[in-house]
Interface confidence: medium
């Protein structure tokens, strides 16, 4: 009789990333008999939920059910029915919900409660919805990219999966930028830390890692823009704000009540003699850069070295993967190439920001104006954060790799989160097993 390949036993997992600006659902799959191997889990689908972040549903919680329906139904289609009941579903909420919780714990709990009730209605193994900490967000992002890059694998490869992958086992640092927070996570050269709050110890696949991480709440790109506007309107002589971070000719009316809605602008809040003001773009990168730098307090540091706002930052070490909005923004601006130097990026940002708004709208006709209008600010903010905030230099810039996906899986915290919660990252190196019918070579 002829040998038939046995059907592969596949497992699935679902993670919802409830971010400040939107929610995305990720479906992962892996061969069951290899779940302790490194690099076998991969993303099969991303479903972007139509609508804003869940924190925006605070006044209309009864709409959360319909909000999540399409993506949950998509998961039902993608995952075989026989697997539904054993497929875990996790929802992790990030900085948007951290901010809502700061305003009202009761309201944040109410949103999460309705989310949990909605997700419990599906035939999957729902494992709960929670607000993850900034430290977790940083750590899981670091685990994700290093898992996907094969950095935890003890097998040395004779080939390279992705352009920036090297055969050495030095881990990549992780730079994550969201709408409401940003995270930096890496293994510093010096294992002793001056700040225990920023220290994490992992044992993964038989190796110890001493990791530095910090999450800067309110320093995601959207909240940073609100901060900048709140800071700048303080010194405006009237209800016109001439803003160098928007293109010449751009105009937008902002409600003062919207500006002060977020806890991130509290430190700049003041009584203004108007209810609205108009942003008038003047498109000047250098001035925008100066304005952004005022958001970073670098005058105080109780450690040997700080990032900003008195937060410890050890000397940067090794290569870094910059993902989420770091990638989205730089990719839009066509600045993700490894060959583009920091000086060239700055030069291109100067050119981009100075382009008239009407010209920009014509050049990028398919892009929604809300986003299009903010790329000048976002690009400038990214440069400021990386160079002045985290102390990258023109030389170390080449160690930053702007990453969207690695081998088809999105870079971000969700995969690391699932790997941890499903116990798929063993502390010790698994014993090698004989080759099975489904072995990947």
């Amino acid at each position: 009789t002829q040998n038939k390949a046995l059907p592969e036993n596949i497992k699935y997992g679902i993670v919802l990333d409830a971010g400040s600006s939107h929610t995305s659902l990720y479906i992962y799959k892996w061969p069951a008999e290899k779940e302790n191997d490194t690099g076998v889990v991969h993303q099969v689908e991303e479903c972007r939920v139509k609508g804003p972040g869940i924190s925006k549903y605070v006044q209309k919680v009864n709409e959360i059910g319909i909000y999540l329906t399409d993506c949950m139904e998509r998961a039902r289609e993608v995952i075989p029915r026989s697997q539904h009941q054993e497929t875990p579903v996790y929802l992790g909420a990030t900085a948007g919900m951290r901010l809502l919780r700061m305003e009202s714990e009761e309201l944040a709990d109410r949103v999460l409660d309705v989310v949990e009730r909605s997700l419990s209605n599906y035939p999957f193994d729902f494992q709960g919805a929670r607000i993850i900490t900034g430290q977790e967000e940083g750590a899981y992002g670091w685990i994700t990219i290093n898992y996907l890059l094969g950095k935890f694998s003890q097998k040395t490869r004779w080939f390279s999966i992705v352009p920036y992958e090297t055969n050495n086992q030095e881990t990549f640092g992780a730079l994550d930028l969201g709408g409401a927070s940003t995270q930096i996570t890496f293994v510093p050269q010096n294992q002793t830390t001056e700040s225990p709050d920023n220290a994490l110890q992992f044992r993964l696949y038989g190796k110890d890692y001493n990791v530095y991480t910090h999450s800067f709440l309110c320093y995601g790109k959207d909240q940073a823009l609100w901060q900048k506007l709140a800071k700048d309107i303080q010194v405006a002589s009237n209800e016109i704000l001439r803003d160098p971070c928007f293109h010449p000719g751009y105009k937008k009316v902002v409600n003062v009540s919207d500006l002060y809605k977020t806890p991130c602008t509290k430190r700049f809040e003041m009584t203004l003699p108007f209810q609205q003001f108009e942003i008038q773009g003047i498109g000047n990168y250098q001035q925008c850069h100066q304005s952004v730098l005022e958001l970073f307090n670098t005058s105080y540091c109780p450690y040997s070295q700080c990032a900003f706002n008195g937060i410890f930052l050890p000397p940067l070490q090794g290569d870094f993967g910059a993902f989420s909005a770091f990638y989205f923004v730089m990719n839009f601006l066509n600045l993700t190439s490894e060959k583009v130097s920091q000086e060239k990026v700055t030069e291109m940002m100067k050119k981009f920001c100075s382009q008239p708004w009407e010209e920009i709208k014509t050049s990028y006709a398919g892009v929604k104006e809300k986003y299009l209008s903010e790329y000048c600010f976002s690009g400038t903010y990214i440069l400021s954060l990386l160079l002045q905030g985290y102390h990258f230099t023109a030389d170390s810039w080449e160690h930053i790799h702007f990453i969207g996906k690695i081998q088809g899986s999105d870079a971000g915290w969700t995969l690391g989160y699932m790997l941890n919660l499903t116990n798929m990252i063993p502390a010790e190196q698994p014993l090698s097993t004989p080759l099975s019918h489904s072995t990947y070579v």
């Epitope: 139509k50 609508g51 790109k221 809300k370």
Partner: nanobody
Framework: EVQLLESGGGLVQPGGSLRLSCAAS????????MSWYRQAPGNERELVAA???????NYADSVKGRFTISRDNSKNTVYLQMNSLRAEDTAVYYC??????????????????WGQGTQVTVSS
């Protein structure tokens, strides 16, 4: 610009049925979420039922099993079939079309259209 016009409301006895229609003057095919809301005197407007572009539906607990939402994109119309009506269903019923555009960095609310409302009275 989408304009919504509701019809089908009226006076009905408890236990009776009504079918509300919401006709859109523009193309609703591109709009993902179509919903029915209602507002009784002195109460806040509440979501009754919603349907997505893919045909997935959601209902308020109070109407589950009694009301059915459907949409016919070829006719640019959304329907609400209301059976086993009760006195507490008495309200002005509004049709709503809402959607968010997708972009690289997260969605942006773009459409939020409301009809003028149609009165439903359940009384013996």
């Amino acid at each position: 610009e989408v304009q919504l016009l509701e019809s089908g409301g009226g006076l009905v006895q408890p236990g009776g049925s009504l079918r509300l229609s919401c006709a859109a003057s523009g193309d609703i095919f591109s709009i993902n979420y179509m919903s029915w809301y209602r507002q009784a005197p002195g109460n806040e407007r509440e979501l009754v039922a919603a349907i997505t572009g893919r045909g997935n539906t959601n209902y308020a607990d109070s109407v589950k099993g009694r009301f059915t939402i459907s949409r016919d994109n070829s006719k640019n119309t959304v329907y609400l079939q209301m059976n086993s009506l009760r006195a507490e269903d008495t309200a002005v019923y509004y049709c709503n079309a809402w959607d968010y555009s997708d972009a690289d960095e997260g969605p942006l609310r773009e459409y939020d259209y409301w009809g003028q409302g149609t009165q439903v009275t359940v009384s013996s």
